[in-house]
């Protein structure tokens, strides 16, 4: 039987190609911050990674996916307190022995310079200045994202 993390990740991967006819998100909802073509919500509470994943799902969003170093830097610029860590949608896949985004793709090793070990039960957090490997079961804040897309947009299902 799959853990809640695996189930949520699998659900997201399986629905990657599904689209919806509802109008695209043209503006960020209240409390969400726009960063280029995304809306980001920085949590004010802390949670383990799996609960953070589930929380984003209930908001019809996903944990943050970072495309490249440029997007990482722009995201980090939105973090006001240098001591605070935020979960993103990247965790270590033991079976594939690699960092895996919740959309099923693997981390390009040049994108993020991760401090800490790549090992079982590890998830990725970001701070104002760095990227860290942490036990997924520790409690920190998290970042949800919604894509700003016209008319036909991909959905992240509730898990």
């Amino acid at each position: 039987q799959k853990s809640s993390i695996e189930k949520c990740s699998v659900d997201i991967q399986q629905s990657r190609n599904k689209t919806t006819e509802r109008p695209g998100l043209l503006n960020c909802p209240i409390y969400w911050q726009q960063l280029r073509e995304k809306c980001l919500l920085f949590s004010h509470t802390v949670n383990p990674w799996n609960n953070s994943l589930a929380d984003c799902s209930t908001k019809e969003s996903s944990l943050l996916l970072i495309r490249d170093k440029d997007e990482l830097i722009h995201t980090q610029n939105l973090i006001r307190d240098k001591a605070i860590l935020f979960w993103i949608g990247l965790n270590f896949s033991l079976s594939e022995k690699n960092w895996k985004w919740i959309n099923g793709s693997f981390l390009n090793s040049n994108d993020l310079e991760i401090r800490g070990d790549a090992k079982e039960n590890s998830c990725i957090s970001i701070s104002q200045t760095s990227v860290y490997s942490e036990y997924c079961s520790t409690e920190i804040r998290w970042i949800c994202q919604k894509e700003l897309t016209p008319v036909r947009n991909k959905v992240y299902p509730d898990s």
Epitope: S3, T45, V46, N50, E120, N121, Y135, C136, S137, T138
Partner: antibody, heavy 115, light 107 residues
Framework: QVQLVQSGAEVKKPGASVKVSCKAS????????MHWVRQAPGQGLEWMGW????????NYAQKFQGRVTMTRDTSINTAYMELSRLRSDDTAVYYC????????WGQGTLVTVSS | DIQMTQSPSSLSASVGDRVTITCRAS??????LAWFQQKPGKAPKSLIY???SLQSGVPSKFSGSGSGTDFTLTISSLQPEDFATYYC?????????FGQGTKLEIK
């Protein structure tokens, strides 16, 4: 230091409701989920649910759905757990606990349900 | 719901002994596991989170290990104040669930 101080013991009749309070100090109240756990006399621990003090969002264990209500008042850093339609088997010590793994606990509130 | 099974249910030991308590989950919980100590008439006290991380202020004689379904709590050298009931808890999925407890008594 972090402190969670709960309201005093209660004696209730079957069918009544009880509301237990948990006043937090020593940390940012809105920064951590507050969980509620109960323990019947001589028994183990049972998780009831949580409230997100920042948003007011809640998640209740299926067993308590429809009977439990968790609320908070951020102006006084206090979380509340109300249990309705009390039965004798709800007699227990009720605890509030900070965060997913209960890094800090209140001292407990004994709720006795007896006719 | 995930069932958490502790063994033994009770344990007699002497001051200075090294003791190990085990906790088994009915399905994999990664390392989303916490251990608590509870003394009669008192609230539980957090000892370990994330299966092996020591809670701030807890002495290093307490240690935790395990991942997936099997976990252990070890107390390296028992002191009189360590005689209590110990509980494990999973926080991998809702509802969070606890083991039934292990009562550690003085031999």
């Amino acid at each position: 230091q972090v402190q969670l101080v709960q309201s005093g013991a209660e004696v209730k009749k079957p069918g009544a409701s009880v509301k237990v309070s948990c006043k937090a100090s020593g940390y940012t109240f809105t920064g951590y989920y507050m969980h509620w756990v109960r323990q019947a006399p001589g028994q183990g621990l049972e998780w009831m649910g949580w409230i997100n003090p920042n948003s007011g969002g809640t998640n209740y264990a299926q067993k308590f759905q429809g009977r439990v209500t968790m609320t908070r008042d951020t102006s006084i850093n206090t979380a509340y757990m109300e249990l309705s339609r009390l039965r004798s088997d709800d007699t227990a010590v009720y605890y509030c606990a900070r965060g997913a793994w209960g890094s800090n606990w209140g001292q407990g509130t004994l709720v006795t349900v007896s006719s | 719901d995930i069932q958490m099974t502790q063994s033994p249910s009770s344990l007699s030991a002497s001051v200075g002994d090294r003791v190990t308590i085990t906790c088994r989950a009915s399905q994999g919980i990664s390392n989303y596991l916490a251990w608590f100590q509870q003394k009669p008439g008192k609230a539980p006290k957090s000892l370990i989170y994330a299966a092996s991380s020591l809670q701030s202020g807890v002495p290093s004689k307490f240690s935790g290990s395990g991942s997936g379904t099997d976990f252990t709590l070890t107390i390296s050298s028992l002191q009189p104040e360590d005689f209590a009931t110990y509980y494990c808890q999973q926080y991998n999925s809702y509802p969070y669930t606890f083991g039934q407890g292990t009562k550690l008594e003085i031999k």
